[in-house]
């Protein structure tokens, strides 16, 4: 297993609709054709897996059905979007990138993006 640098923004604020987007960029040492991207969440000393996708270079990322993640790839950049977030989902979201094929296997883990989620205030009752 060889190490690889992964960069991601330090902080992102989710939209009022609970959507957060950030770029995960990796320094590919070679010409990988199969890449796996996993998003991890660290909160309260627990690390959980948010979503994962394997893609072939040049193709779209495909996440599992009912995943809260979507994404696109462009070269060594992955544009990730996480939907349906609520205030309780605030935490450090870590991008993990694995170059699966061809060998050798490379692994890179970013420092994490702190995503802040603020639940929207309920709309006041209106007579209109």
């Amino acid at each position: 297993c060889k190490a690889m640098h992964v960069a991601q923004p330090a902080v992102v604020l989710a939209s009022s609709r609970g959507i957060a987007s950030f770029v995960c960029e990796y320094a590919s040492p070679g010409k990988a054709t199969e890449v796996r991207v996993t998003v991890l969440r660290q909160a309260d000393s627990q690390v959980t897996e948010v979503c994962a996708a394997t893609y072939m270079m040049g193709n779209e990322l495909t996440f599992l059905d009912d995943s809260i993640c979507t994404g696109t790839s462009s070269g060594n950049q992955v544009n990730l979007t996480i939907q349906g977030l609520r205030a309780m989902d605030t935490g450090l979201y870590i991008c993990k990138v694995e170059l699966m094929y061809p060998p050798p296997y490379y692994l890179g883990i970013g420092n994490g993006t702190q995503i802040y989620v603020i639940d929207p205030e309920p709309c006041p009752d209106s007579d209109f």
Partner: antibody, heavy 123, light 106 residues
């Protein structure tokens, strides 16, 4: 159809390592998580840990220092290793299929379970 | 960790009775599952995502709730429903189960 089956020794000596294998069929380990749950005789259910579709693991904090879960996707197998066992680890151990990730739009359930295997810790 | 308190721990009921089992969490949770377990058998999923009926489960079972309080209801108890029922939260890890409710024949 979806099936999970636990296997491993039924008797483990104190201080040794308990090793179990969950062999699955009817679904892919890259599309679902596999969750481990145990039940001491006559007692309730205790969640032990999970290995998600992406291969990341999460453990019950009470067992974290002793527990390891791994998988071999090509063999459709998930393994559980619990070290330094005592009589308190005597239980029926179940593996179950569950959500592929911790955060989903829907589908929060362990929908298929293995039949369970009784592990007794005794000298 | 989120603790799940299930009540009652046991109950006696007759065929045809309406049975309600409650589960209370120590903090607000997002989703609840309910399982049925018979002696010597693995748990069986009844309800997922708080209120959705699992495949093949009779419609007499229903789930509801939000926040910290959740309920499993059996509208008309049948002979095959005598078992132990467990709630389980999906809001945070570690996942936790309620202590179980044993439904016995009166």
């Amino acid at each position: 159809q979806v099936q999970l089956q636990e296997s491993g020794p039924g008797l483990v000596k104190p201080s040794q390592t308990l090793s179990l294998t969950c062999t699955v069929s009817g679904f892919s380990l890259t599309s679902y998580g596999v969750y481990w749950v145990r039940q001491p005789p006559g007692k309730g259910l205790e969640w032990l840990g999970v290995i998600w579709a992406g291969g990341t693991t999460n453990y019950n904090s009470a067992l974290m220092s002793r527990l390891t879960i791994s998988k071999d996707t090509s063999k459709n197998q998930v393994s559980l290793k619990l070290s330094s066992v005592t009589a308190a680890d005597t239980a029926v151990y179940y593996c179950a299929r569950g959500p592929p990730h911790a955060m989903m739009k829907r589908g929060y359930a362990m929908d298929y379970w293995g039949q369970g295997t009784l592990v007794t810790v005794s000298s | 960790d989120i603790q799940m308190t299930q009540s009652p721990s046991s109950l006696s009921a007759s065929v045809g009775d309406r049975v309600t089992i409650t589960c209370s969490a120590t903090s607000s949770i997002t989703y609840m599952s309910w399982y049925q377990q018979k002696p010597g058998k693995a748990p069986k999923l009844l309800i997922y995502d708080t209120s959705n009926l699992a495949s093949g489960v009779p419609s007499r079972f229903s789930g509801s709730g939000s926040g910290t309080d959740y309920t499993l209801t059996i509208s008309s108890l049948q002979p095959e429903d005598f078992a132990t029922y467990y709630c389980q939260q999906w809001s945070s890890y570690p996942l936790t189960f309620g202590g179980g409710t044993k439904v016995e024949i009166k």
